[in-house]
C-alpha cells in the first residue's frame, strides 16, 4: 500500500529516512531493461528491506528487486515504458514509503567508450571521437554528449563541450603547447526520454605539440 506503515512493530523503522532514488537503463542487455534503486542515506539498515515495483508492467502486477549489496536491482523485459510505476520500500507485506515514477524519465545511458584523440598536422587540430552503444538501440538513440577536457596540472579547470554527434574537433591554438591533457565524455538522453548523465568514459590522455620557434606553430608529436 502507498504511504507509511502504521504497524506498531514498525515504529522504529518509521523513524528512519527511507528516501531512495532510482535510475533505469533501457536495452542494457539485449532487449532487457534494468532498474536500479538505492537509499539516499547510506546508514539505513537494509537487512529486512525489500523493493517492489507495481504498475506500468507487461502482464504482471508487480516485480521484486534483487538485493546486490547496497543496491536493489531488476532486469526485465516487462516495462511498458509509458506511465508511472509505484516503487515501494517494503518490510514483509508492509510498505514503508512509495514513489510514483515514470521509468522513461529516469534513464541513465551507458557510458561512452573507445574515446580517442588524433592530431592532424596539416589542419592544426585534434579530432576527438568516441563510441556509444546507444547508436544500435531501439529506444534511447538520441543523446547529448558532454566532452570535458583539462590540462593535467589543472585539477579542477575542466572545459566542457556539448554535442549531439560522436566527433569533435579541438583547435590546436585553443590548447596550451607542450602540455598533457586529459579528456573524457558522458551522455544524457536528449529526446523523448529524460534522466541522468551516464558515468564518465575512461579518460584518454594526449600531449599537444611544442611551438615551432620559427613559425610560432606547434611541433607535431
Amino acid at each position: 500500500e502507498s504511504g507509511y506503515a502504521q504497524n506498531g512493530d514498525l515504529e522504529d523503522a518509521e523513524l528512519d529516512d527511507y528516501s531512495f532514488s532510482c535510475y533505469s537503463q533501457l536495452e542494457v542487455n539485449g532487449s532487457q531493461h534494468s532498474l536500479t534503486c538505492a537509499f539516499e542515506d547510506p546508514d539505513v539498515n537494509i537487512t529486512n528491506l525489500e523493493f517492489e515495483i507495481c504498475g506500468a508492467l507487461v502482464e504482471v502486477k508487480c516485480l521484486n528487486f534483487r538485493k546486490l549489496q547496497e543496491i536493489y536491482f531488476i532486469e526485465t523485459k516487462k516495462f511498458l515504458l509509458i506511465g508511472k510505476s509505484n516503487i515501494c520500500v517494503k518490510v514483509g507485506e508492509k510498505s514503508l514509503t512509495c514513489k510514483k515514477i515514470d521509468l522513461t524519465t529516469i534513464v541513465k545511458p551507458e557510458a561512452p567508450f573507445d574515446l580517442s584523440v588524433v592530431y592532424r598536422e596539416g589542419a592544426n587540430d585534434f579530432v576527438v571521437t568516441f563510441n556509444t552503444s546507444h547508436l544500435q538501440k531501439k529506444y534511447v538513440k538520441v543523446l547529448m554528449h558532454d566532452v570535458a577536457y583539462r590540462q593535467e596540472k589543472d585539477e579542477n579547470k575542466w572545459t566542457h563541450v556539448n554535442l549531439s554527434s560522436t566527433k569533435l574537433t579541438l583547435l590546436q591554438r585553443k590548447l596550451q603547447p607542450a602540455a598533457m591533457y586529459e579528456i573524457k565524455v558522458r551522455s544524457i538522453p536528449d529526446h523523448y526520454f529524460k534522466g541522468f548523465w551516464s558515468e564518465w568514459s575512461p579518460s584518454y590522455y594526449f600531449r599537444t605539440p611544442e611551438i615551432n620557434n620559427s613559425s610560432g606553430e606547434m611541433d607535431p608529436i
Partner: antibody, heavy 119, light 105 residues
Framework: QVQLVQSGAEVKKPGASVKVSCKAS????????MNWVRQAPGQGLEWMGL????????SYNQKFKGRVTLTRDTSISTAYMELSRLRSDDTAVYYC????????????WGQGTTVTVSS | EIVLTQSPATLSLSPGERATLSCSAS?????MHWYQQKPGQAPRPWIY???KLASGIPARFSGSGSGTDYTLTISSLEPEDFAVYYC????????FGGGTKVEIK
Amino acid sequence: QVQLVQSGAEVKKPGASVKVSCKASGYTFTGYTMNWVRQAPGQGLEWMGLINPYNGVTSYNQKFKGRVTLTRDTSISTAYMELSRLRSDDTAVYYCARGDGNYWYFDVWGQGTTVTVSS
Amino acid sequence: EIVLTQSPATLSLSPGERATLSCSASSSVTYMHWYQQKPGQAPRPWIYEISKLASGIPARFSGSGSGTDYTLTISSLEPEDFAVYYCQEWNYPYTFGGGTKVEIK
C-alpha cells in the same frame, strides 16, 4: 477536444475474425496507452488488453491472449483490436479507452462498436 | 487474479437521499477507480485513485477506502445520478467490479 472515434457495427459468423479501429484526436497519440474493454449485453466491463502506441508494446488479459491482437498506426493516430476465432459469447460492445499513465484509469472512451457473432 | 465484489447489486433510493456503494477486493489493492455508465452510453470516469474526482464531477460525490474495502458516496442524490457505477483496480489486469445500479425508488 480529446476524442476517440470507433469503426461501425459488425456482424460476424462463428470462427471468423473482426478488426475494430479507434481513431484518436486532440492529444498526442503516443503519450497514452490505448486500452480495449468489452461489455456483453446486460453484463459488466471486461478489460482485454492495452498497447503503448509509442513502441507497440502490448499487455493482454490472459483470458484473451492468443485470440486478441492489438496494433496501431501512429501516422494516422489509430489503434486496432482484432479478435479471432469468434464465438457467440464474444457478442458485445467493444470500447477503446485512453489510459491515463499517472493514475492508470481510463479517462477518455470511444463510443463503442457493437460486434454480433451469429450463425 | 483479484476479484472485485460490488454491493449492493441494486440500490433503490429517492432523490435527496444519501447513497453508499461498496467495492470489496479479494486481496489488497493500492488504488481504486470508479466509473459511471448510463444505458446506451460508454462508461465515464468518475473517481480516480480512490478519492480524486474526474473533471466535471460534482462535489456531492466522494470516494474513500484502503486495502480491500472501498466506498463511493453520493451525499444527496440528484436525478442525473441514477446509473450503474463500476469500481476498477488500477493495476493489471485492470479488473472491474460487477457494478451497482442506483435506481429511483
